[in-house]
Amino acid sequence: TLNSVLNSNAIKNLPPPLGGAAGHPGSAVSAAPGILYPGGNKYQTIDNYQPYPCAEDEECGTDEYCASPTRGGDAGVQICLACRKRRKRCMRHAMCCPGNYCKNGICVSSDQNHFRGEIEETITESFGNDHSTLDGYSRRTTLSSKMYHTKGQEGSVCLRSSDCASGLCCARHFWSKICKPVLKEGQVCTKHRRKGSHGLEIFQRCYCGEGLSCRIQKDHHQASNSSRLHTCQRH
């Protein structure tokens, strides 16, 4: 089961003490069999297993990637998993921890020594799940070394959203990923109805910006399901 497979997942954020302020931010701590936290006059405990469901790597932390934790089990459930360190196996860049990228199925360092001018590298993007590419072959793209030292501007090649400047996200464009603008109010957005469908997009949109959510456009309520337009709207 998911529980047993992922029980090593680190606790993510602690709840506030019972009787504390509602909505009080939790503090990150490391994993332990049961975490003690103050509550009133005695200590309360919280299970260290806190799965975080996701659809895109960008929903996870920078030290995580989004994937189905088991082959065949709990179909459609994707959660944030700890990134893979150097020399660990991978299927796409986001699986590798920051400072590394996926090359020939192994996480390798992306430090300066690996980037003298322009290099060619394999991007093994996973479409829909972690175990397949669109056509079973790797696509090739050119990455610039400077991408690893400055935040990417719009149109820059990226591996993850943290590579992009503020207000941009890393999204698919053909067979690579580039920095694109986070969507503003009124802009068309993609609402993923089917589990894993985001993996099939070759022109991926960013998510809606702060305070906005991707919702059906008012005047499109009567339209057929397939033609309904979603836009970024205020909460």
Partner: nanobody
Framework: EVQLVESGGGLVQAGGSLRLSCVVS????????MAWFRQAPGKLREIVAA????????YYTDSVKGRFTISRDDAKKTVYLQMNSLKSEDTAVYYC??????????????????WGQGTQVTVSS
Amino acid sequence: EVQLVESGGGLVQAGGSLRLSCVVSGGTFSVYAMAWFRQAPGKLREIVAAISRTGSSIYYTDSVKGRFTISRDDAKKTVYLQMNSLKSEDTAVYYCAVDGRANGERPAVAGYNYWGQGTQVTVSS
């Protein structure tokens, strides 16, 4: 100030149903994953169900699969937990938790950083 307010708890007979709601108010952040946890007396607080930002990925703990349904309404900044076929072992205080992030913010590890005060659910046999 951010507030998470749960409602819908109460006393119910075994086999009955309840629908919990949690409204997020205050703050100018985007709500990513949302979850329901529960804590029975003398036990660890455990996750019950969680839903991703887009709603396309949903996690349930084994003991509630097929009985509980989590959903979210982003327009209302609300997360729901529909609980059917309740059992006495479902008796606990239920807490909602969310991941609220400022635009473009991405932590090293994603997690639930805002929590509600809890609502009591008691299932009598």
